[in-house]
């Protein structure tokens, strides 16, 4: 994922409790990962800026049959104001860059932790 340090708002900001739950879920995924996450599936990288939650969901929704990220997909759908279906793409995807789901989750986690801190202290 690119633009990790972007100052733009991440779109509709979830309440801190919901954001905290999403982060906890991503932490669980990264800590419990033994075999390659989602069999090493690749997803489109996204810009972590406005509309990030929808973009993340649009990327991850194209991964099927991976129970490890199903809860994350459900949580992200709660943060995205519009319905997202497989094959849908927004301008936030870095369409020339695909990364493994595991890396996508790690990058998203780092950024969400940062957003959580910003929300706590500002």
């Amino acid at each position: 994922l690119t633009c990790l340090g972007g100052f733009a708002s991440p779109g509709p900001v979830p309440p801190s409790t919901a954001l905290r739950e999403l982060i906890e879920e991503l932490v669980n995924i990264t800590q419990n990962q033994k075999a390659p996450l989602c069999n090493g599936s690749m997803v489109w990288s996204i810009n972590l800026t406005a509309g990030m939650y929808c973009a993340a969901l649009e990327s991850l929704i194209n991964v099927s049959g991976c129970s490890a990220i199903e809860k994350t997909q459900r949580m992200l759908s709660g943060f995205c104001p519009h319905k997202v279906s497989a094959g849908q793409f927004s301008s936030l995807h870095v369409r020339d860059t695909k990364i493994e789901v595991a890396q996508f989750v790690k990058d998203l986690l780092l950024h969400l932790k940062k957003l959580f801190r910003e929300g706590q202290f500002n």
């Epitope: 409790t17 801190r117 202290f121």
Partner: antibody, heavy 120, light 107 residues
Framework: EVQLVQSGAEVKKPGATVKISCKVS????????MHWVQQAPGKGLEWMGG????????ASNQKFKGRVTLTADKSTDTAYMELSSLRSEDTAVYYC?????FGGGPFAYWGQGTLVTVSS | DIQMTQSPSSLSASVGDRVTITCKAS??????LSWFQQKPGKAPKSLIY???RLVDGVPSRFSGSGSGTDFTLTISSLQPEDFATYYC?????????FGGGTKVEIK
């Protein structure tokens, strides 16, 4: 190895201001929040406030009624706690503490403490 | 502010004893609770976070449990180096608040 190294003991007069530093090593300074905790002699622990070193955003305990100023210098990986209008009840050991909120908790790492004595 | 009520304030125990310390929050803290050990003249040391997760390097005789408002720190078999003061901390919301402490002394 994570280390938080605090500045040395201070003796101050009532009404004065003290500024304590906390130099971080062993992790990326902006990755974890930094908090400050007061411990008066023979007493328990009290949270004073915290700062996000990345943005400089702060939160503090109303008990200190705006007397606490928290800052962070990203260029030197150092956090600072300034306590003004000192009174005798502020005589205490002050600790800086940090950590990953989601992986160890926000108070996973501690400085060695700085004793501040307020006396006329 | 969330109040953290820790009990007992002190206890006497022998090496090998099972020791239990409790912390009660004035409202649900979503298991955002840590436990610390402090020895005289030293900084606190983190033992448990998120109510039941053991900090790396902490002996397995320490364990945390509980949810909602009621939490427990258990030392399954007290060792000589465990005589110290223990504190709980809620970090669910600001202002973060500590329990009053429990001093574990030698019987």
């Amino acid at each position: 190895e994570v280390q938080l190294v605090q500045s040395g003991a201070e003796v101050k007069k009532p009404g004065a201001t003290v500024k304590i530093s906390c130099k971080v090593s062993g992790y990326t300074f902006t990755d974890y929040e930094m908090h400050w905790v007061q411990q008066a002699p023979g007493k328990g622990l009290e949270w004073m406030g915290g700062i996000d070193p990345e943005t400089g955003g702060t939160a503090s305990n109303q008990k200190f009624k705006g007397r606490v100023t928290l800052t962070a210098d990203k260029s030197t990986d150092t956090a600072y706690m300034e306590l003004s209008s000192l009174r005798s009840e502020d005589t205490a050991v002050y600790y800086c503490t940090s950590g990953d909120y989601f992986g160890g908790g926000p108070f996973a790492y501690w400085g060695q403490g700085t004793l501040v004595t307020v006396s006329s | 502010d969330i109040q953290m009520t820790q009990s007992p304030s002190s206890l006497s125990a022998s090496v090998g004893d099972r020791v239990t310390i409790t912390c009660k929050a004035s409202q649900d803290i979503n298991s955002y609770l840590s436990w610390f050990q402090q020895k005289p003249g030293k900084a606190p040391k983190s033992l448990i976070y998120r109510a039941n997760r053991l900090v790396d390097g902490v002996p397995s005789r320490f364990s945390g449990s509980g949810s909602g408002t009621d939490f427990t720190l258990t030392i399954s078999s007290l060792q000589p180096e465990d005589f110290a003061t223990y504190y709980c901390l809620q970090y669910d919301e600001f202002p973060y608040t500590f329990g009053g402490g429990t001093k574990v002394e030698i019987k």
